[in-house]
């Protein structure tokens, strides 16, 4: 920032309430979407144009005018692979975090005309592209279909789909929220000849019922009922199956062949919890337990001369944990070798930090190609002589990510291709890949203002700047914008890290108002290197408030041991360090410790109005917003992975002394604003309605707000401005700020 | 290169029975159904049956109770069996590969004369 | 069953010459129909798929048109090599039935 040190000279405006709420201030994205291995996508003015990487010059691929008559608002579009369709989607209508419905059309850019024979029906559940040329297949009713051609009949694929009951091909809501966090259950092979798919069976799973108010005029509220299976509760089972698309035929049924979960699945209940391709006859399917610390994959092939899929045992990989749960949130999909033989994986090393492992299909042991006491996030891109993996290594940060590739003919050489690329200003990648890995787009997304350049594999050559949002800098050169401070503090000889947003003009001989603002849910990480233009933003720039988060036991990146800390737990360990935090951040000489209020949503909501009900007396107030209250009413998968089942013999004596009801009366000495949506169909409005309920019981005195037929994103405009207009006045009472 | 070859052709009996044999190169007798259609002389094209990729079998009504479609998938081969032949069954009969709703390949046809 | 019914039989035209030859079905098959060629002594050979597609290999001056129960084969120039019978054939249900042939000859 330009101007001086001292905030009374500074004549600058200030990032205000009005410009988060009105996003005053935008960052330049710069999405872009790869359609072969030197040629991307791009949106620009509403024309789409393919741009060639290596050059850097574009034609115009579809001009905006194109669809002026079209006479629908489009809403999402996708290019078939062979580039001669493009499917356009409108009439979107949400559903929930990822699924919604929707009309398609479809467009021959050869004809330059819109197909009007077989169109897909209106309220289309899940639409994709075959991998290759141009074959789609789509969910409506609960039913999959394919189509070989656009102009074709579709030929259906299943008979059995049913609301509420039966899905074929995509995802009920436990599995769309928490194994697969997509809607679909469809996987097309390689080259599009087979098609998988999952069937989930929901007949048995209780609903959850809550009121819809839709319009003021409708007289009688609407009931809203989902499947959705609570902690404990019946589970929704699941099968799947593989079709082949060559033998479909208008006069008979499609034959689809059922691959069986393994026998040590079968003995009790278990989810499909992921579906990879290796080869076009090679499929990998990983299944879990309900109890998730034991998983099975199965590497299953195509037998040509029965059309069956057999998966042998001595093909299968366990993976499983003695300290708590598989994967971070379940098992790290594989990475396969093109000749299907092997594949890479993420797993916990003995050391209790997720690292790279090199599987061969008929070996039991793998090989770790990466070591230390940090973690790789992701594995990106694999070819036949490097993977390319991000991970927080760099410097010692957790929350840094880097972009690295390893040769694989020697584990040694491992080169950090984003590193030193503009040390101070990004420290935060994400990377795309062109479809054969030639070329990649580098995504940084912080500390500096997010910044998009454009490489080659070949040489790791930085071949452009996308975009570099130099007219958003120009901007808030003229705002006095806070500063963010990431670091840590040692408790028992462990380092836990913290992000601070610092007024402007920050004087640490001054004391400042803190708010914790504090999610630390298993795997979580809020103290990060990432840009963020939020509410914290503002309250730090116009109200000179001091943001803070931190990453105690249970967070993630850092190692199985302070992630597992909280198994079993929840509401224990996650919840005393966000307190000890508060002390620690209080004894640092800038901290106002009168005025420290905490605030979380969905788990940050459980946490801060643990915290709150501590009765540490650190906190002079807080806001929760859609709480969980009590884990028995939460969805099982989420759930049990942390807790186990709430029966005697398991974990119910912990579920029920981590409730927040238990605590209503320290409440007493605290502020309180308890929010909610009352449509909320991931955290119920059941579980502050139980809060509200024992703190009255107790006679304490709360704020709370409620939000109408709003989700758990409280995300309409009006709601929106609405909650956190409503929270800042929160903030500035408890804080006595003007 | 996908191929289809009849073979069985002759001179049978009234009230024999006929066994053709249709070998197939070129893809998979599991993935792909294979049709059996007759033609007789000057005449236009009959269809007989079908045995589908997972084995399944239809026939035309007027062949249910004498034809028997079959499969050795590990030769690659489809028969095609028709009992209490007659006269009428003189045709030539051909196998053919069944691509979602058409014929896209043909075999040569094989010729079958019934005659005492 | 459903009946396919041909028209006309037979007829006659010169290389050159816009050729139709009609298709009715007994009752609605939407767009499942196919066409075939059926030269002397040989096999019929796919033409035309799903009422309008073009098979692979297939020169152009073949097109289909119709849906329901009406349907039309065109030859928009007829070359040396046309001169052969013509099918129909329903795919929308079983069995699979034929129309009795279009038999084009050389005037």
């Known amino acids: 920032n330009k101007g001086t040190d001292d905030a009374t000279a500074d004549s600058r405006k200030t990032y205000t309430l009005t410009d988060y709420l009105k996003n005053t201030y935008r960052l330049k994205l710069y999405s872009l979407r790869w359609i072969s291995d030197h040629e991307y996508l791009y949106k620009q003015e509403n024309n789409i144009l393919v741009f060639n990487a290596e050059y850097g010059n574009s034609s115009v691929f579809l001009e905006n005018s194109t669809f002026d008559e079209f006479g629908h608002s489009i809403n999402d579009y996708s290019i078939s692979p062979d580039g001669q369709f493009i499917l356009l989607e409108y009439n979107y209508v949400k559903q929930w975090r990822h699924s919604y419905t929707a009309s398609y059309d479809i467009y021959d850019l050869n004809k330059r005309q819109l197909i009007t024979e077989e169109r897909i029906p209106n309220n289309t559940q899940w639409v994709t592209w075959s991998p290759v040329g141009h074959k789609l297949a789509y969910v409506w009713n609960n039913d999959i279909y394919v189509k070989i051609e656009p102009n074709l009949p579709s030929y259906r694929i299943t008979w059995t789909g049913k609301e509420d009951i039966i899905y074929n091909g995509i995802t009920d809501w436990v599995y769309e929220e928490e194994v697969f966090s997509a809607y679909s259950a469809l996987w097309w092979s390689p080259n599009g000849t087979f098609l998988a798919y999952a069937q989930f069976n929901d007949t048995e799973v209780p609903l959850i019922e809550y009121s819809f108010y839709s319009d003021e005029s409708l007289q009688y509220p609407k009931t809203v009922r989902v499947p959705y299976p609570k902690a404990g509760a019946v589970n929704p089972t699941v099968k799947f199956f593989v079709v082949n698309t060559d033998s479909l035929s208008s006069v008979t049924n499609a034959t689809s062949i059922q691959i069986t979960a393994p026998a040590s699945m079968l003995i009790g209940d278990h989810y499909l919890c992921d579906v990879t391709w290796a080869t076009q006859e090679r499929i990998s399917l990983q299944w879990l337990r309900r109890i998730q610390n034991y998983s099975v994959m199965d590497i299953c092939d195509y037998d040509e001369s029965s059309g069956r899929w057999n998966c042998l045992v001595a093909r299968q990989h366990i993976e499983m944990s003695t300290t708590g749960w598989v994967g971070r949130f379940r098992p790290s999909e594989p990475h396969f070798t093109l000749d299907g033989n092997s594949f890479y994986k993420i797993i916990s090393n003995e050391e209790g930090y997720r690292h790279i492992c090199y599987f061969q299909i008929d070996k039991k042991d793998c090989t770790f190609i990466t070591k230390g006491t940090w973690e790789v996030i992701g594995i990106e891109a694999l070819t036949s002589d490097y993977l390319y993996y991000i991970s927080n290594e760099y410097k010692g940060m957790p929350g840094g990510r880097n972009l690295y590739k390893i040769q694989l003919s020697d584990y040694t050489k491992v080169t950090c291709l984003s590193c030193e690329l503009n040390p101070e200003r990004c420290q935060y990648y994400s990377v795309s890949f062109s479809k054969e890995a030639k070329y990649y787009q580098l995504r940084c997304s912080g500390p500096g203002l997010p910044l998009y350049t454009l490489h080659s594999s070949v040489n790791d050559k930085g071949l452009r700047v996308l975009e570099d949002n130099s007219a958003l800098d120009k901007m808030l050169q003229n705002v006095q914008m806070p500063s963010k401070k990431l670091d840590f503090i040692i408790l028992n000889e462990t380092k836990f890290w913290y992000q601070m947003i610092l007024p402007p003009h920050f004087d640490k001989s001054k004391k400042y108002p803190l708010l914790l603002d504090v999610y630390a849910g298993p795997c979580s990480q809020k103290a990060d290197t990432v840009f963020r233009l939020n509410w914290a933003t503002y309250l730090a720039s116009t109200e000179n408030i001091i943001v803070a988060s931190f990453d105690g036991r249970g967070s993630g990146y850092q190692g199985d041991k302070i992630m597992h800390a909280i198994n079993r737990r929840l509401g224990t360990f996650e919840v005393e360090d966000q307190i000890e935090a508060a002390r620690q951040f209080s004894k640092m000489g800038f901290v106002d410790n009168k005025r420290i209020a905490i605030w979380g949503w969905s788990y940050g909501g459980y946490v801060t109005s643990m915290v709150l009900g501590s009765g540490s007396g650190v906190f002079k107030c807080g806001i929760a917003v859609a709480p969980v209250s009590r884990w028995e009413y939460y969805d099982s998968v989420y759930t049990e992975r942390y807790m186990g089942l709430p029966t005697p013999e398991d974990n119910l004596d912990h579920y029920r002394n981590s409730t927040v009801m238990s605590r209503a009366e320290n409440f007493k000495q605290v502020e309180y604003l308890l929010i909610h949506g009352t449509a909320d169909d991931n955290v119920h409005f059941q579980q502050s309605a139980q809060i509200s309920k024992a703190l009255v019981d107790v006679g304490v005195d709360f704020q709370a707000m409620w939000y109408t037929d709003e989700d758990h994103g409280i995300a309409s405009s009006t709601a929106h401005q609405h909650i956190y207009t409503h929270m800042s006045h929160f903030i500035k009472q408890c804080f006595s700020l003007p | 290169e996908v191929q289809l070859v009849e073979s069985g052709a002759g001179v049978k009996q009234p009230g024999g029975t006929l066994r053709l044999t249709c070998t197939a190169s070129g893809f998979s007798l599991t993935t792909y159904g294979v049709h059996w259609v007759r033609q007789a002389p000057g005449k236009g094209l009959e269809w007989v049956g079908v045995i589908w990729g997972d084995g399944r079998t239809d026939y035309d009504a007027a062949f249910m109770s004498r034809v028997t479609i079959s499969k050795d998938t590990s030769k690659s081969t489809v028969y095609l069996q028709m009992n209490s032949l007659r006269a009428e069954d003189t045709a030539v009969y051909y196998c053919?590969?069944?691509?979602?709703?058409?014929?896209?390949?043909w075999g040569q046809g094989t010729t079958v004369t019934v005659s005492s | 069953d459903i009946l396919m019914t041909q028209s006309p039989s037979s007829l006659s035209a010169s290389p050159g010459d816009r050729v139709t030859i009609s298709c009715r079905a007994s009752?609605?098959?939407?767009?499942?129909l196919n066409w075939y060629q059926q030269k002397p002594g040989q096999a019929p050979r796919l033409l035309i798929y799903y009422s309008s597609n073009l098979h692979s290999g297939v020169p152009d001056r073949f097109s289909g048109s119709g849906s329901g129960t009406d349907f039309t084969l065109t030859i928009s120039r007829l070359e040396p090599e046309d001169f052969a019978a013509y099918y129909c054939?329903?795919?929308?249900?079983?069995?699979?039935?034929f129309g009795s042939g279009t038999k084009v000859e050389i005037k």
């Open positions: 054939q329903q795919s929308i249900k079983l069995p699979l039935t």
């Open positions: 053919m590969r069944n691509r979602h709703d058409w014929f896209d390949y």
């Open positions: 009752q609605d098959i939407r767009n499942n």
